[in-house]
């Protein structure tokens, strides 16, 4: 299976969480249970978090990674768009931007990437253990699809891992690859929540010898110096199904954008917008077919011209993102 | 396996139009863009114009924008062409292939010939 | 709109012999597409993205090249090889190929 997930930055220690939480031990299994819920292809990246201020409130982000412009991106939940899945957003760089809810705020972050917060109470709030689909449309390439969901639990003595669905078009070349990597890294995570449950966590100052380092920088390449994993996911355990949406769904031709506003798409254009702007740092990306481990902040080797952030109309720190240094 | 059927040989008049087929089979026609070629004979490709069925977008090359019109049918998953005020220049292989994750796929190529 | 302009226009190879041809755009691009085609067939893309070879490609293929620039290599000549090869670019529409390299066995 092809498996592409966003990993959370390594954050500065923070008040009350020199423990367990700060343990560098923890930076691995981290980044391997995020890996372990989240598949699709190399060219797709999902990250879904829930706001631990609002547990009803989540965030969905995903990006483009692949060659070509993005002609149309659809966010739907509860599997794969076609496949049983509920459309939440549909986003033209051209005609605009679509929502349902609980969708309340989909929008455009940079020329290949699109956040989409939901939000809402009662039959058609998202949980937990929804799955989250986004599904990338490029000229002249076609379609890339990749879903995800929040880790089933953050408790470090979490019995097992959970196996991701195989996600449409999958190649038995990526299947064969990625699951031998998975397969280790739940073994490997395994071992290590059971050898932490096993003992206390030791109150560790950042160290540069700690034999984990090395492997928590492959990983999550970021300061080898910051020692605690700031995780932003809160979890809960309920197990429910995302309600079907009474509203209408984008189908037919092209006459369903009418309604829109011309400014609804807030993406640069032409050619000037593709110039070498780097997207600022958002934490790490881990392609692992590709064997790729590379900051946000850097251009991937198989993408095209550097992209560009929309003007923000709260400031740069608005631009930040989930994943953005606070 | 995936296949796309082209319509057969197409014989017109100067100044018609004609309307060539590409039927789509073993694969989701709405999520991939269908591209239209021409070839003359003996000579290189031309890149006409795309469709995505999704949602009808379009992408013509400047010198076939208003000539050629791209439609799709996704209930038939069938891609069409249609060319206007057609002449001799017009004489040629018109293909459609579709990219589906780096791998593309053509049809066998519809012959137009435009002869009074 | 970009033009391609490949070279040499026709070029003869022996087996085993080691193949080069060229295709130059004449404003920058971020990446050249080759296709191959038989005579009577319908092309076939044999590099995408400059250097990535499609799925079934036997890896005496190479692609190369930035900006103006590219190249398709063929490490040691078969006679299979033997066909015409046309290079283009999916930058800014037009989306233009080149005239094509016509590979002809000795």
């Known amino acids: 299976m092809r498996t592409e997930a966003q990993v959370p930055a390594l954050q500065p220690p923070e008040p009350g969480l020199e423990g367990a939480m700060g343990h560098r031990t923890l930076v691995l299994p981290w980044v391997l249970l995020t890996l372990c819920v989240t598949a699709g292809t190399p060219e797709v990246w999902v990250q879904v978090r829930m706001e631990a201020t609002e547990l009803s409130s989540f965030t969905i982000r995903c990006g483009f990674l692949g060659s070509g412009s993005i002609s149309l991106v659809t966010v739907s939940w509860g599997g794969p768009n076609g496949a049983g899945g509920t459309t939440l957003a549909v986003l033209h760089p051209e005609r605009g931007i679509r929502q349902w809810a609980p969708a309340r705020q989909a929008r455009w972050e940079t020329q290949s990437s699109i956040s989409l917060i939901l939000e809402g109470s009662g039959a058609s709030s998202p949980c937990a253990n929804t799955t989250f689909c986004c599904k990338f449309a490029s000229f002249p390439e076609g379609s890339w699809e990749a879903c995800g969901s929040l880790p089933p639990s953050s408790d470090p003595g979490l019995s097992a891992p959970p196996t991701p669905a195989p996600i449409l078009r999958a190649d038995l070349a990526g299947i064969l690859g990625v699951s031998g990597v998975l397969l280790f890294g739940c073994v490997y995570l395994l071992h290590l929540l059971r050898r932490h449950k096993h003992r206390p966590a030791p109150r560790l100052q950042p160290s540069r010898t700690s034999p984990q380092a090395p492997r928590a920088r492959a990983w999550a390449p970021s300061q080898a110096s910051q020692a605690a994993l700031h995780v932003p996911y809160a979890t809960i355990n309920t197990s429910c199904r995302p309600a079907t949406l009474d509203t209408a769904h984008p189908h037919g031709g092209p006459s369903w954008w009418a309604s829109l506003p011309t400014h609804a798409a807030h993406r640069p254009q032409g050619p000037a917008a593709w110039a070498s702007t780097p997207i600022p740092a958002r934490g790490s990306f881990v392609s692992v077919e590709n064997g790729l481990y590379a900051q946000a902040g850097e251009r991937p080797p198989h993408t095209g011209p550097g992209l560009t952030l929309f003007p923000d109309p709260r400031g740069p720190r608005a631009m930040e993102g989930p994943l953005g240094v606070r | 396996q995936v296949q796309l059927q082209q319509s057969g040989t197409i014989l017109a008049r100067p100044g018609a139009s004609v309307k060539m087929s590409c039927r789509a089979s073993?694969?989701?026609?709405?999520?991939?863009?269908i591209q239209w070629i021409k070839q003359r004979p003996g000579q290189g490709l031309e890149w006409i114009g795309a469709?995505?069925?999704?949602?009808?977008?379009?992408r013509y090359t400047q010198k076939f924008k208003g000539r050629a019109t791209l439609t799709a049918d996704k209930s038939s998953s069938t891609a069409y062409m249609q060319v206007n005020s057609l002449t001799s220049e017009d004489s040629a292989v018109y293909y459609c292939?579709?990219?589906?994750?780096?791998?593309?796929?053509w049809g066998q190529g519809t012959t137009l010939t435009v002869s009074s | 709109q970009i033009v391609l302009i490949q070279s040499p226009a026709i070029m003869s190879a022996s087996p085993g012999e080691k193949v080069t041809m060229t295709c130059s755009a004449s404003?920058?691009?971020?990446?050249i597409h080759w296709y191959q085609q038989k005579s009577g067939t319908s092309p076939k893309r044999w590099i995408y993205?400059?250097?990535k070879l499609t799925s079934g490609v036997p890896a005496r293929f190479s692609g190369s090249g930035s900006g103006t620039s590219y190249s398709l290599t063929i490490s040691s000549m078969e006679a299979e090889d033997a066909a015409t090869y046309y290079c283009?670019?999916?930058?800014?529409?037009?989306?233009?190929f080149g005239g094509g390299t016509k590979l002809e066995i000795k």
């Open positions: 283009q670019q999916w930058n800014i529409n037009p989306y233009t």
């Open positions: 292939a579709t990219f589906i994750n780096y791998v593309d796929y």
């Open positions: 469709i995505f069925p999704e949602n009808g977008d379009t």
């Open positions: 993205d400059t250097t």
């Open positions: 073993d694969y989701t026609f709405t999520d991939y863009w």
């Open positions: 404003s920058s691009v971020n990446n």
